[in-house]
């Protein structure tokens, strides 16, 4: 947890989801009239998000503690997790309703179905994560979080299908980080860059986080990372070995989340 731009953040909260993203004026928060909010969204090739679009984004982890204009002059903000300083302890869209005065100043919630999406919260039994734009090169200045949450008792088997990120000795420029937890604070497994395929990873519990970051310069081919569910009964999930065996890394049992 931590503060960013005056907003209480946990990395599981997505900065954009399902094509929806938050924008504010260059002077800071709550400076846009309805017409200006609309123009900001249009400038970036989008439009003001509808209430339904904002709610769909909220359902997959979009959480912003700042009221903004939506389509049809509505104002509100999406809350995933209730908190004392935001959302009056409620979850859902905190809805200020349709504003009669369109000159009021708020932020903006935009929708762009063509925005290059990355990250999200995933509960599927298997899935492939790709760097934005794959198989084309990824862009500069990308930050993506993929949060996997399976059923209690299940584990996650991660395998790298394609991997090509800018190489530097400390992986300080572009990298993928894996965490054996539901955030990017606990259970750090490793940071990866370059073009060598990392070994498979099997989680200790039912949650895992992948973080992809690219800096402002060189880009490369990107990656595809696959995960599948390992059920409690299956052979590989019984392994207690914390060292690498074959091409799999087994993690010591530390984290398990409902």
């Amino acid at each position: 947890w931590g503060f960013k731009n005056g907003i209480f953040h946990n990395s599981i909260w997505l900065e954009q989801a399902a094509g929806v993203y938050h924008r504010e004026a260059r002077a800071g928060r709550y400076k846009l009239t309805y017409a200006e909010a609309k123009a900001v969204c249009e400038f970036e090739g989008g439009r003001l998000a509808t209430y339904k679009q904002l709610e769909a984004a909220r359902k997959i982890g979009f959480h912003v503690c700042a009221a903004g204009w939506m389509a049809k002059g509505r104002v509100g903000y999406p809350i995933v997790k209730p908190g004392p300083n935001c959302g009056f302890g409620k979850t859902g869209i905190i809805d200020y309703g349709i504003r009669l005065n369109r000159s009021e100043r708020w932020d903006a919630y935009c929708y762009n179905p063509h925005a290059k999406e990355c990250g999200g919260v995933f509960t599927d039994p298997k899935r492939i994560f790709k760097s934005p734009g794959f198989p084309n090169e990824y862009d500069d200045n990308q930050v993506c979080y993929w949060h996997i949450r399976l059923k209690y008792g299940q584990r996650i088997h991660l395998s790298f299908l394609d991997f090509d990120l800018e190489h530097d000795p400390g992986c300080l420029a572009d990298y993928v980080e894996i965490y054996d937890s539901y955030d990017d604070v606990h259970g750090f497994v490793g940071r990866y860059c370059g073009d060598e395929l990392p070994e498979d990873i099997i989680s200790t519990g039912n949650v895992m986080t992948l973080k992809f970051l690219s800096d402002a310069s060189v880009t490369a081919g990107g990656f595809q990372i696959k995960y599948v569910t390992v059920d409690p009964a299956s052979k590989s999930s019984q392994a207690k070995n914390t060292s690498t065996t074959g091409n799999k890394k087994f993690l010591p049992g530390r984290f398990s989340h409902l």
Epitope: A25, R26, A39
Partner: antibody
């Protein structure tokens, strides 16, 4: 689609004034500022200033203050720039361009330019 | 005023090559909110400038992903990954952090 249509070429005498127009279409005129830019061959581009049609506010490059007057007619979605006391230094092409000063997007769509010739 | 210096003045390239253009400011273009307002434009012969990149690295609507922008503070770069004939023209940067807005002198991209 967004369009900015500028008025035709102008031939004016030294010391006189000229009023250039920029008619816009395809977007909400009052939500974007209109910037004016001077482009002299071999000397690059110079920003003159902007006007925000929503409230008529302006922001100028000090170099052009007093020399350029920016106005708008919201009923016709048209912006105007009047240049005063013209000299041969002002003979060049002038562009209008749409911008979002309050978002910091800079300027996106440009007009085709108006050529001004100052000659006696 | 923030003086924008662009290099090189002329950039001869072969089609399919990567091109890189630099833009340097005499003062930081990061504002008090941590935002940096630096744009890149292409002006083809006889045409108006067209916006390619805004806020350092964001591609404008319809701009191909062969174009990418990077940098921070006072140093910025525009890269074109695989130059095509339609990319030829004069590229220039524009800073809109400080008033007056100021332009780079331009870089002419031409065929080698």
């Amino acid at each position: 689609q967004v369009q900015l249509q500028q008025s035709g070429p102008e031939l004016v005498k030294p010391g006189a004034s000229v009023k250039l127009s920029c008619k816009t279409s395809g977007y909400t005129f009052t939500s974007y500022d209109i910037n004016w830019v001077k482009q002299r061959p071999g000397q690059g581009l110079e920003w003159i200033g902007w006007i925000y049609p929503s409230d008529g506010s302006t922001k100028f490059n000090e170099k052009f203050k007093g020399m350029a007057t920016l106005t708008v007619d919201t009923s016709s979605s048209t912006a105007y720039m009047e240049l005063h006391s013209l000299t041969s230094e002002d003979s060049t092409v002038y562009f209008c361009a749409r911008g979002l000063w309050y978002y910091g997007g800079g300027v996106d769509y440009w007009g085709q330019g108006t050529s001004v010739t100052v000659s006696s | 005023d923030a003086v924008m210096t662009q290099t090189p003045l002329s950039l001869p390239v072969s089609l399919g090559d990567q091109a890189s253009i630099s833009c340097r400011s005499t003062q930081s273009l990061e504002d008090s909110n941590g935002n940096t307002y630096l744009n890149w434009y292409l002006q083809k012969p006889g045409q108006s400038p067209q916006l390619l990149i805004y806020r350092v690295s964001n591609r404008f609507s319809g701009v191909l992903d062969r174009f990418s922008g990077s940098g921070s503070g006072t140093d910025f770069t525009l890269k074109i990954s695989r130059v095509e004939a339609e990319d030829l023209g004069v590229y220039f940067c524009l800073q809109v952090t400080h008033v007056p807005y100021t332009f780079g002198g331009g870089t002419k991209l031409e065929i080698k």
